[in-house]
C-alpha cells in the first residue's frame, strides 16, 4: 500500500555511521580472532595475568603478559573480560561481537488525517540489542521552505519492527523525504529515500468485521455489513466505501461505490445457490489520500429454498414461491440504499 511514495536517491538526508563505543571497548565480527590487552601498566612484562569472563565464572584463562587471544568469537562472547594480578582487579576489557545491520526497507503510512505518519521497518532477522535506528527527514512546504530533522525509532520485540513517528498536524500540506539509518557498533546501513505528501499518503486500514448473510426468501440477495477500522475516528472524518463481489468460481468482480458513511449494503444480483466472495475498502469521504487495502475475503451464499417432503415423499410444494418471483417483492423487504455500480465487471 505504498505505491504513492517516490524515491529521491540523489538527496543525502544525514550521515549514517556506526555507533561509537565506550573507550576501550573491542568490537569484532563473528568468527574473527580477537586480541584483548589488559589495560594496566602493571600487566606489562612477564607477569602472570588471570582472566575471567564476566558472563560466567567458568571461563578463565591465565596468560604470561597482558594479552589474551580469543579465536572464532561469537555473539555470545560479548561481555566484560576482567584481568587480574595477584587476585586484584587490574582492568576490564569490554568485548562487543556484533553483526552489521541489514539494509532497511522503509515504509511509511498515515492511517487517518488526525494522526502522525509512521515509518517502519521489519528486519528479516532479529537485530542485536545494540542496534539503533534513526529516521533522517526533510520537511518541504511552500511557506517555510525546507527543514531537516531526525526522529528516534523504537524497536518493538512484539511487532519485531522499528517504528518512527513523523509529526504531522491536521490539515498540514507538506512533503517529507525520509531515510532510515540503522546502526550498531560494527556497521551501519541507510534505506532508500522515501517521499510522501502529508495528505495524499492518508490511507485507512481496511474496514473491519465484514459480515455477509443471506436474506430469507431472497435467493439472489446478500446482505453485507461492516464497521470502520479501529484506527479511524468517524466523528471527525467520514469514510466512503467500495464493495466488490464475485462468485467463487469467477475472477471478475462487480464493484459498487457506496454513499458516504454507509456501513451496509444489499447485493441484488447474486447468483442463486452460489457462494460469493465479498470485500470492502474505504477512503476518506472527500477523496483525501488513498483507498484502503481490500478487507479480507468473506464468503456468503444467498438464501436457498429448502424443499419440503410431502407424506408421499414428493419433493415439490407448489405453494413455495420465492419472494423474488412474486410481483410485489419491492414491498416485502425494505429497499436498500441505491448503490452505483462502477467498473463492473472488474478483472483484478
Amino acid at each position: 500500500h505504498h505505491h504513492h511514495h517516490h524515491h529521491h536517491h540523489h538527496l543525502v538526508l544525514g550521515s549514517c555511521r556506526a555507533l561509537e563505543v565506550a573507550n576501550g571497548t573491542v568490537t569484532s565480527l563473528p568468527g574473527a580472532t580477537v586480541t584483548l590487552i589488559c589495560p594496566g601498566k602493571e600487566a606489562a612484562g612477564n607477569v602472570t595475568i588471570h582472566w575471567v569472563y564476566s558472563g560466567s565464572q567458568n571461563r578463565e584463562w591465565t596468560t604470561t603478559g597482558n594479552t589474551l587471544v580469543l579465536r572464532d568469537v561469537q555473539l555470545s562472547d560479548t561481555g566484560d573480560y576482567l584481568c587480574s594480578l595477584n587476585d586484584h582487579l587490574v582492568g576490564t576489557v569490554p568485548l562487543l561481537v556484533d553483526v552489521p545491520p541489514e539494509e532497511p526497507k522503509l515504509s511509511c503510512f498515515r492511517k487517518n488525517p488526525l494522526v502522525n505518519a509512521i515509518c517502519e521497518w521489519r528486519p528479516s532477522s532479529t537485530p542485536s540489542p545494540t542496534t539503533k535506528a534513526v529516521l533522517f527527514a526533510k520537511k518541504i512546504n511552500t511557506t517555510n521552505g525546507k527543514s531537516d530533522f531526525q526522529v528516534p525509532c523504537q524497536y518493538s520485540q512484539q511487532l519485531k519492527s522499528f517504528s518512527c513517528q513523523v509529526e504531522i498536524l491536521e490539515g498540514d500540506k507538506v512533503y517529507h523525504i525520509v531515510s532510515l539509518c540503522v546502526a550498531n557498533s560494527v556497521g551501519s546501513k541507510s534505506s532508500h529515500n522515501e517521499a510522501f505528501h502529508s495528505l495524499k499518503m492518508v490511507q485507512p486500514d481496511p474496514p473491519a468485521n465484514l459480515v455477509v448473510s443471506a436474506i430469507p426468501g431472497r435467493p439472489r440477495w446478500l446482505k453485507v455489513s461492516w464497521q470502520h477500522p479501529e484506527t479511524w475516528d468517524p466523528s471527525y472524518y467520514l469514510l466512503q466505501f467500495q464493495l466488490r463481489y464475485r462468485p467463487v468460481w469467477s475472477k471478475e468482480f462487480t464493484v459498487l461505490l457506496l454513499p458516504v458513511a454507509q456501513y451496509q449494503c444489499v447485493i441484488h444480483d447474486a447468483l442463486r445457490g452460489v457462494k460469493h466472495v465479498v470485500q470492502v475498502r474505504g477512503k476518506e469521504e472527500l477523496d483525501l489520500g488513498q483507498w484502503s487495502e481490500w478487507s479480507p475475503e468473506v464468503t456468503g451464499t444467498p438464501w436457498i429454498a429448502e424443499p419440503r417432503t410431502t407424506p408421499a415423499g414428493i419433493l415439490w410444494n407448489p405453494t413455495q414461491v420465492s419472494v423474488e418471483d412474486s410481483a410485489n417483492h419491492e414491498d416485502q423487504y425494505e429497499s436498500s440504499t441505491e448503490a452505483t455500480s462502477v467498473l463492473a465487471p472488474v478483472q483484478e
Epitope: E42, V47, S54, N86, H88, G91
Partner: antibody, heavy 116, light 107 residues
Framework: QSLEESGGDLVKPGASLTLACTAS?????????MCWVRQAPGKGLEWIGC???????TYYASWAKGRFTISETSSTAATLQMTSLTAADTATYFC??????????WGPGTLVTVSS | DIVMTQTPSSVSAAVGDTVTINCQAS??????LTWYQQKPGQRPKLLIY???TLASGVPSRFKGSGSGTDFTLTISDLECADAATYYC?????????FGGGTEVVVK
Amino acid sequence: QSLEESGGDLVKPGASLTLACTASGFSFSSGYYMCWVRQAPGKGLEWIGCIYTGSDTTYYASWAKGRFTISETSSTAATLQMTSLTAADTATYFCARDLGSRGNLWGPGTLVTVSS
Amino acid sequence: DIVMTQTPSSVSAAVGDTVTINCQASENIYSFLTWYQQKPGQRPKLLIYRASTLASGVPSRFKGSGSGTDFTLTISDLECADAATYYCQRNAYSSWAFGGGTEVVVK
C-alpha cells in the same frame, strides 16, 4: 617478611610530613603493589593510594589526589608525602603489600597527630 | 569512586551463634572483594579474598559469598576470639574502597 612504617609525628595544621615504609625479607623490584591506608581514632579503614613498584604507576583515592604523593625511594622503601595537613588527617597510617592468594602483609602502623 | 556499604554497623551474639555481615558495592565489582578482621590496636588481618576464597590459616567457620554488588560474610559457631571489627574491601589496586566496618560483640 615484614613491613614497618616510620615518620609518624605530632605536627601543626598546615604542615607537611613524609612517612616511610620499609620492607624486610623481600625487595620491591619484583613488582609489588605497595598501598597506604589510614585509620582515624575509633574509625574505619580509609584507602589513600597504591604504587606499583618498579614503575611510575600510582593510584589515589579522589580525596587524596594533590595532597598525598606515594613514591618508591629504594628497592626496599616507599614513602607517603602529605601536605597541608589538618586535624582530620590525624590517624594511624598503615602501609600494606596485598597479594591476595600469595599473601597479605601489613605494617603495625604509625600515628600522625595534627594539632595546634 | 565506588562506595562500599556495610550492614549492620554492630552486632551482638552469643558463643556458638551464627553472625551474618552484608556488604554492598555501588557498582558491579564482580568477585573482587576481600574481608578483613581487625582487633583493637592491631593491624587488619586478611580473612577472605576473591569474595569466597579462605586465606591461609583462617578457620572454615568463616565463609564468604556473593558477586557483583552484594556480598556476605558468615561466621558460624561464634567464638570469643571472633570479637573484632570486620571490613569488606573492593579488591582493585586502582581503587581500593573499604566498607564502614561491622563490630562483632561476643556475649
